[in-house]
């Protein structure tokens, strides 16, 4: 369906607000540093040309593809050299290159403040004062921060978010009714943030066919009552709404999603059972809904695996015919039976399979080669299911800020060279997996916890890849997608890496420490326990407990001094040179 | 409540050994690391040494390093510190307390005085 005029299209589809919101996010995730109002300016100017394309597509430029459009409009900007460096030879490109070379300058960790909230009563009149200007800067401040940000649901997040100013400004306690509702959308938008990123790093990292796998294992377990030809629709819609958005094509992704939300909700009936609520939500609600909907039952009387994918003599013919159409069908199959079952496990299984079927299909007596087949997947399974009960163990017995030094420690031993700041961020990411899966059942806890870590360590990938310092993590994140979790648990700690020099500084805390909230004050002292393995990695985990415990007690103390700026200098000079003796650093 | 009470100080010559008991009550002691600190005339307190719950990681300032032994006998719920080859500036009191490199406020002994003198 080729229409005149894309740009005309995708405002008609979308509507002028939801256009002009798409538009801003995309420009704040390509140029992550420019002020807001030169994003605001650069987003009205496109949609005046856009609503001149819709009265007459026929108009000058009119015909030109969204990229070039953007793609121009983007290279206006005046600084760009000067604030961006050598993203400003983008803009000596042509298209397709052009935006390639805009996608390839996303910054992941990009040096931005931290956004501190203000006090309650000055966003409400800031709110009141101008509501459009205060959802605008809401979408520009997080597509900058998160310039992989799945679009069409960073709507959902903005309408969320100004339901809660409307609804709280008015109420007799604004900071009671509000600011719970601020802390669930800025945990739930992280949380969605590293989702979406993994999709998109499973796309432009492993290609087309890996998230299209992982597609057809989590549909499947999701609608485990859909024919696997349904299954495959949806896996082929839903790759061309995520190639999209993680393309930078956030019209073409928005007006996708709501396409592929139309249909489910126009065929649950062969889809899921459980789809109904979701569907009678409006457009944005309905989205989401769907992509967070309940594994629908398992249908009664599935027959046995092995009938096809094993006993059956055609097993070799089958494959060589249609290997991926082949190979689709054993993951629809096997992701259906075991909700109980993560993602990447299943896609493990997949490639056993794959494995030995491209072994057995050339051996002599290709049906004795792979008959054992299944007994391979065994230990695959296992390895997870024992990682979680020993980790699930841990935690419930250390609670989760003692779980994630344990995890601090494990990692930082593993892996370090990589920074400080990722080390506590991806460790402390780990660690929620605890509070986080382990109350589920044991037929939750693996898809529940293992997917999770799935969704961590692609951060740890990606804040790695910008600067590479361990080979180690490089290998785990490069050589498979679906391995990396087994990779980073597999590792020990590194003998090859030597000891930092000890710096008093690193350790020298200051009075601030106790007006800083609990969380913070967390990440102080788990950043003080990396920096500690980093100084001293022979230390035994009982050692760092020790000094760690102390360090607590003499913060406490301290915070509780009348002169604290003293107290800190002083006591803290002896804390470092008795841990330094203690730990020999 | 905490209680922790050291006896075995006293007035040794250069060259001489001590040994310091530290008895403990109204805590797990087992559960916990222990240390050693000591306060000179007009100076302030200094971590001597620290020992882990199970007795491992004995650790020591520099100060003292191959002179003091740290040791517990967690049957007895004691903590001990062997002093040898004792020096006019290890004359202080000496303090048991909990924590492994950091006396934990209000989790310390009433102190033994330790002088070296000829």
């Known amino acids: 369906d080729a229409h005149k005029s894309e740009v005309a299209h995708r405002f008609k589809d979308l509507g002028e607000e939801n256009f002009k919101a798409l538009v801003l996010i995309a420009f704040a995730q390509y140029l992550q540093q420019c002020p807001f109002e030169d994003h605001v300016k650069l987003v009205n100017e496109v949609t005046e040309f856009a609503k001149t394309c819709v009265a007459d597509e026929s108009a000058e430029n009119c015909d030109k593809s969204l990229h070039t459009l953007f793609g121009d409009k983007l290279c206006t900007v005046a600084t760009l050299r000067e604030t961006y460096g050598e993203m400003a030879d983008c803009c000596a490109k042509q298209e397709p290159e052009r935006n390639e070379c805009f996608l390839q300058h996303k910054d992941d960790n990009p040096n931005l403040p931290r956004l501190v909230r203000p006090e309650v009563d000055v966003m409400c009149t800031a709110f009141h004062d101008n509501e459009e200007t205060f959802l605008k800067k809401y979408l520009y401040e997080i597509a900058r921060r998160h310039p992989y940000f799945y679009a069409p649901e960073l709507l959902f997040f903005a309408k969320r978010y100004k339901a809660a100013f409307t609804e709280c400004c008015q109420a007799a306690d604004k900071a009671a009714c509000l600011l719970p509702k601020l802390d669930e959308l800025r945990d739930e938008g992280k949380a969605s943030s590293a989702k979406q990123r993994l999709k998109c790093a499973s796309l432009q990292k492993f290609g087309e066919r890996a998230f299209k796998a992982w597609a057809v294992a989590r549909l499947s377990q999701r609608f485990p009552k859909a024919e696997f030809a349904e299954v495959s629709k949806l896996v082929t819609d839903l790759t061309k709404v995520h190639t999209e958005c993680c393309h930078g094509d956030l019209l073409e992704c928005a007006d996708d999603r709501a396409d592929l939300a139309k249909y489910i909700c126009e065929n649950q009936d062969s889809i899921s059972s459980k789809l109904k609520e979701c569907c009678e939500k409006p457009l944005l609600e309905k989205s989401h809904c769907i992509a967070e909907v309940e594994n629908d039952e398992m249908p009664a009387d599935l027959p046995s695996l092995a009938a096809d994918f094993v006993e059956s003599k055609d097993v070799c013919k089958n494959y060589a015919e249609a290997k991926d159409v082949f190979l689709g069908m054993f993951l629809y199959e096997y992701a259906r039976r075991h909700p109980d079952y993560s993602v990447v496990l299943l896609l493990r299984l997949a490639k056993t399979y794959e494995t030995t079927l491209e072994k057995c299909c050339a051996a002599a007596d290709p049906h004795e080669c792979y008959a054992k087949v299944f007994d391979e997947f065994k230990p695959l399974v296992e390895e997870p299911q024992n990682l979680i009960k020993q980790n699930c163990e841990l935690f419930e017995q250390l609670g989760e800020y003692k779980f994630q030094n344990a995890l601090l420690v494990r990692y930082t031993k593993k892996v370090p060279q990589v920074s400080t700041p990722t080390l506590v961020e991806v460790s402390r990411n780990l660690g929620k997996v605890g509070s986080k899966c382990c109350k589920h059942p044991e037929a939750k806890r693996m898809p529940c916890a293992e997917d999770y870590l799935s969704v961590v360590l692609n951060q740890l990938c990606v804040l790695h890849e910008k600067t590479p310092v361990s080979d180690r993590v490089t290998k785990c994140c490069t050589e498979s997608l679906v391995n990396r979790r087994p990779c980073f648990s597999a590792l020990e700690v590194d003998e090859t890496y030597v000891p930092k020099e000890f710096n008093a500084e690193t350790f020298t805390f200051h009075a601030d420490i106790c007006t800083l909230s609990e969380k913070e004050r967390q990440i102080k002292k788990q950043t003080a326990l990396v920096e500690l393995v980093k100084h001293k990695p022979k230390a035994t985990k009982e050692q760092l407990k020790a000094v760690m415990d102390d360090f607590a007690a003499f913060v406490e103390k301290c915070c509780k001094a009348d002169d604290k700026e003293t107290c800190f200098a002083e006591e803290g000079k002896k804390l470092v040179a008795a841990s330094q003796a203690a730990l020999g650093l | 409540q905490v209680q922790l009470q050291e006896s075995g100080g006293g007035l040794v010559q250069p060259g001489g050994s001590l040994r310091l008991s530290c008895a403990a009550s109204?805590?797990?002691?087992?559960?916990?690391?222990m240390t050693w600190v000591r306060q000179a005339p007009g100076k302030g307190l200094e971590w001597v040494s620290g020992i882990l719950e199970g007795g491992g990681s004995p650790a020591y300032a520099d100060s003292v390093k191959g002179r003091f032994t740290i040791s517990r006998d967690d049957a007895k719920n004691t903590l001990y510190l062997q002093m040898n080859s004792l020096k006019p500036e290890d004359t202080a009191v000496y303090y048991c307390a909990k924590g492994y490199v950091y006396a934990r406020e209000g989790a310390r002994s009433q102190g033994t005085q330790v002088t070296v003198s000829s």
């Open positions: 109204g805590f797990a002691f087992s559960s916990f690391p």
